[in-house]
């Protein structure tokens, strides 16, 4: 017999053929024998199975002696063996309708897991395979489970039914609910204004939420938050602001945050956690204040930095156009009477400068001057 | 190690007064908000005060309007609760706490002071 | 006012058992939410703030979930030190309000 595969809420067509190419009587029925519709004449007629509302022909297919039944929004209990009755002969088809929902939501928090269930008639042993819009397959019976979604699993998931050899395809929509970044690295001179940004890697239409930032400063011995906030259909109002260092926040999407100064005592590392209406857990973002200060105090000049730096990064300190005097991998640098002119400190990452102080040092009859 | 402690509880007549102290230590004090919560007998906690970094932002529960006033000194690194005009139902265990968990929590809590209006 | 309503307001329950009390706000209130730990003649103990975040030196049995007027404590495998009362608190508007409570008692 024919095996024909069909998709919750899909519609299907079983064909029948006679050898007439003519409108001849014709009957559909279900594995018990229940008549589904058939023909008297010109005329399509029900009868008394569960199918009565969603079943129908293609009447302009008679005159070719094609009897197809169309069964439309497929049930799994659809499932059956449906027989066609013409000219004396009987022509069955195997229906196996299959379904395959996501576990909850398919909009997920970047870190949760996602579970794709399929609905499957009694009887059958169907395999599936699914392959996620970064090309990574997975493979499972009635249920597939991902753990630890990432962002470039959001998009589209295709999954393949397959059942006595034949496949039905199934596509998923999946949005992964994450900050574009998981980390960012600011940095600044002192004194300088600072700029966090945490754009979101997704679009929703209505946004409500809340949030905080908690600030760990390198010179602290304790961590705590710096802003709470409130998100009200992709508006921001602060809740309460810490009073130093007293932060602004922009008003709009994306969050924004001003730190008016970079100061010493502000830098180290931060974790921006947004809750989001109707999720349970939180999306997070690190982002991390490196500030530099170049200072002149009597025959002695230093620059320093604070803040989360790696072990690789360079600190040096160099008279402008010539080569460095000092150059270390510390946090701390400096040189015993400098002579006089434009010195610069410069913090780099193999070569590449990414942040630098400049600090005019007079001759030594003078006290300096910061450009 | 983060320390409130609280003193000043006894026992004191209807429409009387009381100031409740909150001692802290362990911590920069003048960095954090700061609330008091009560326990009358057998019951359960009810938010009473809080005040921010530098007592020029309070909140008061409407029960307690004009007649408790929260209030602190940052050089003595201490909170107080300012109790007038008291009545029975203010009978209860006092507790300073820091507002100092993520998500606005109350992260750590003296050990109470015990409160008695009667006659 | 914010009304914090919890349930149930008491549970017997043995070493080892699942616990979850649930505490429902009168209005949405995101994840501006906490849980406490009191037990007799102490002070209430950090458990959950943020609704899900786990305070710090917290045993991981104790777990939070939920968001807007729906929340959940809950304890995975209830150990003898457990047994005490817990309470839920909303911070999203002022005055903050607390739950009535939920006794944890031994079976």
């Known amino acids: 017999k024919k095996v024909v595969l069909g998709k919750k809420g899909d519609t299907v067509e079983l064909t029948c053929t006679a050898s007439q190419k003519k409108s001849i009587q014709f009957h559909w029925k279900n594995s018990n024998q229940i008549k589904i519709l058939g023909n008297q004449g010109s005329f399509l007629t029900k009868g008394p199975s569960k199918l009565n509302d969603r079943a129908d022909s293609r009447r302009s297919l008679w005159d070719q002696g094609n009897f197809p039944l169309i069964i439309k929004n497929l049930k799994i209990e659809d499932s059956d063996t449906y027989i066609c009755e013409v000219e004396d002969q009987k022509e069955e088809v195997q229906l196996l309708v299959f379904g395959l929902t996501a576990n909850s939501d398919t909009h997920l928090l970047q870190g949760q897991s996602l579970t794709l269930t399929l609905e499957s008639p009694p009887g059958s042993s169907p395999s599936v395979q699914c392959r996620s819009p970064r090309g990574k397959n997975i493979q499972g019976g009635k249920t597939l489970s991902v753990s630890q979604l990432e962002l470039q699993d959001s998009g589209t998931w295709t999954c393949t039914v397959l059942q006595n050899q034949k496949k039905v395809e199934f596509k998923i929509d999946i949005v992964v609910l994450a900050f574009q970044k998981a980390s960012s690295i600011v940095y600044k001179k002192e004194g300088e204004q600072v700029e966090f940004s945490f754009p979101l890697a997704f679009t929703v239409e209505k946004l409500t939420g809340s949030g905080e930032l908690w600030w760990q400063a390198e010179r602290a011995s304790s961590s705590k938050s710096w802003i709470t906030f409130d998100l009200k259909n992709k508006e921001v109002s602060v809740k309460r602001v810490t009073q130093d260092p007293k932060l602004q926040m922009g008003k709009k999407l994306p969050l924004h945050l001003t730190l008016p100064q970079a100061l010493p005592q502000y830098a180290g590392s931060g974790n921006l956690t947004l809750a989001l209406e109707a999720k349970t857990g939180k999306l997070h973002q690190e982002v991390n204040l490196v500030v530099m200060r170049a200072t002149q105090l009597q025959k002695n000049l230093t620059c320093e930095v604070w803040g989360p730096t790696s072990p690789k990064l360079m600190l040096s300190l160099k008279l402008e156009n010539k080569e460095a005097k000092v150059s270390k991998r510390e946090k701390a640098v400096w040189v015993l009477n400098p002579e006089a002119g434009m010195w610069q400190c410069l913090l780099s990452d193999s070569g590449q400068v990414l942040l630098e102080s400049n600090i005019k040092v007079l001759p030594t009859w003078s006290t300096p001057v910061q450009p | 190690e983060v320390q409130l402690v609280e003193s000043g509880g006894g026992l004191v007549q209807p429409g009387g007064s009381l100031r409740l102290s909150c001692a802290a230590s362990?911590?920069?004090?003048?960095?954090?908000?700061m609330s008091w919560v009560r326990q009358a007998p057998g019951q359960g906690l009810e938010w009473v005060a809080n005040i921010n970094e530098d007592g020029n932002e309070k909140y008061h529960v409407d029960s307690v309007k004009g007649r408790l006033t929260i209030s602190r000194d940052n050089a003595k690194n201490s909170l107080y609760l300012q109790m007038n005009s008291l009545r029975g139902v203010d009978t209860a265990v006092y507790f300073c706490a820091r507002e100092g968990g993520q998500w606005l929590a109350l992260d750590y809590w003296g050990q109470g002071a015990l409160v008695t209006v009667s006659s | 006012d914010i009304q914090m309503t919890q349930s149930p307001s008491s549970v017997s329950a043995s070493v080892g058992d699942r616990v979850s009390i649930t505490c429902r706000a009168s209005q949405g209130i995101s994840s501006w939410l906490a849980w406490y730990q009191q037990k007799p003649g102490k002070a209430p103990k950090l458990l959950i703030y943020g609704a899900s975040g786990l305070q710090s030196g917290v045993p991981s049995r104790f777990s939070g979930s939920g968001s807007g007027t729906d929340f959940t404590l809950t304890i995975s495998s209830l150990q003898p030190e457990d047994f005490a009362t817990y309470y839920c608190q909303q911070a999203n508007s002022f005055p903050w309000t607390f739950g009535q409570g939920t006794k944890v008692e031994i079976k």
């Open positions: 362990g911590f920069t004090f003048s960095s954090y908000w």
